[in-house]
Interface confidence: low
């Protein structure tokens, strides 16, 4: 499974969208967990509503929010007020009893906010949201613009 690397600015929001086969994962709750080390366990951060039909409702744990569009097959996780300590390897999971199937591995990188940096124009932040297979990151600036950028390059 490919690891998608997403970058976000400190103090801002990062939105990750993990896509999945809606039929295959019918009735399953989703979770967002943080992997402890490369081979370590994945520590649950937040999971979708206990009642699958209410999975579209946002569930929050601290600054992390999850919601699942079960018809579209997209679970969305938002990391609010991103901090350096949020950097690390995460997983989107589909839960089936005690088992968890990995939908997407996501490496979150946190960069300092370069809005005041004269060189910031070189940072690749397109003006329109772009989607791609697997995961998508959206970066909303303090200027109330919504922009997005793909895995870093």
């Amino acid at each position: 499974l490919n690891t998608t690397v997403l970058q976000g600015m400190a103090g801002q929001s990062l939105r990750v969208s993990c896509t999945y086969d809606a039929l295959k994962h019918w009735g399953r709750r989703k979770a967002w967990c943080r992997q402890l080390g490369e081979e370590g366990p994945c520590q649950r951060v937040v999971s979708t509503h206990g009642v699958w039909l209410l999975a579209f409702l946002k569930k929050r744990n601290g600054s992390t929010v999850i919601a699942d569009d079960t018809l579209a097959g997209t679970v969305t996780i938002t990391l609010k007020n991103l901090q350096a300590g949020d950097a690390g390897l995460y997983q989107c999971q589909s839960l089936r009893g005690r088992e968890a199937e990995v939908l997407q591995k996501v490496l979150v990188e946190v960069l300092e906010d370069p809005l005041d940096d004269q060189d910031a124009g070189d940072l690749w932040v397109p003006e329109e949201s772009s989607s791609f297979e697997g995961a998508q990151v959206e970066h909303s600036t303090s200027r109330n613009q919504e922009t997005s950028f793909p895995p870093t390059s």
Partner: antibody, heavy 116, light 107 residues
Framework: QVQLVQSGAEVKKPGASVKVSCKAS????????MHWVRQAPGQGLEWMGI????????TYAQKFQGRVTMTRDTSTSTVYMELSSLRSEDTAVYYC?????????WGQGTTVTVSS | EIVLTQSPATLSLSPGERATLSCRAS??????LAWYQQKPGQAPRLLIY???NRATGIPARFSGSGSGTDFTLTISSLEPEDFAVYYC?????????FGGGTKVEIK
């Protein structure tokens, strides 16, 4: 202006290690990832991996996993790429590259020759 | 990993002619594809990013198109300084990969 200056050419014996440096200037060092790309003589470009200078986290191409180590020194705005267990196929020009609009700034390249 | 296949391997043209270079990805890379130019002894130079956007300072004769798996770099009228090797590169997923290159040589 934004600049990446790499260390000089190296000649190494098979089995040895090489450490190439890339000093950044003209921008906020911790705000941009750094890539390493190599090019063997007469061959194409090959991506080796990436380092986040802010936290030091890395992601390496599977081909180099276990042989490559990328580090950084924020006090000198320098990133390093160390490649161990060198073999003749590692003879190449090694570039550091800073992503902006894709890889928009490159170092001048460091030639590493592996020969017995 | 995503494999990028460039064609042709060599393109022999005269100054003033139109050059069309192709890059095909083994799976969709959306529009996250860049084109580079490299001359002997020099580092690669970014021409096009995100499939169709010209990088700063790149002449209008260079244009890129495509999305998904098929991409094209077009040089509308070759100048003497355009004879070089051209690489495509995807950054949709790690590992980042490059095509094998197309050499544009003087006929």
């Amino acid at each position: 202006q934004v600049q990446l200056v790499q260390s000089g050419a190296e000649v190494k014996k098979p089995g040895a290690s090489v450490k190439v440096s890339c000093k950044a200037s003209g921008y906020t060092f911790t705000s941009y990832y750094m890539h390493w790309v190599r090019q063997a003589p007469g061959q194409g470009l090959e991506w080796m991996g990436i380092i986040n200078p802010s936290g030091g986290s890395t992601t390496y191409a599977q081909k180099f996993q276990g042989r490559v180590t990328m580090t950084r020194d924020t006090s000198t705005s320098t990133v390093y790429m160390e490649l161990s267990s060198l073999r003749s196929e590692d003879t190449a020009v090694y570039y550091c590259a800073r992503p902006g609009k894709s890889m928009d700034v490159w170092g001048q390249g460091t030639t590493v020759t592996v020969s017995s | 990993e995503i494999v990028l296949t460039q064609s042709p391997a060599t393109l022999s043209l005269s100054p003033g002619e139109r050059a069309t270079l192709s890059c095909r990805a083994s799976q969709s890379v959306s529009s996250y594809l860049a084109w580079y130019q490299q001359k002997p002894g020099q580092a690669p130079r970014l021409l096009i990013y995100d499939a169709s956007n010209r990088a700063t300072g790149i002449p209008a004769r260079f244009s890129g198109s495509g999305s998904g798996t098929d991409f094209t770099l077009t040089i509308s009228s070759l100048e003497p300084e355009d004879f070089a090797v051209y690489y495509c590169q995807q950054r949709s997923h790690f590992p980042i990969t490059f095509g094998g290159g197309t050499k544009v040589e003087i006929k």
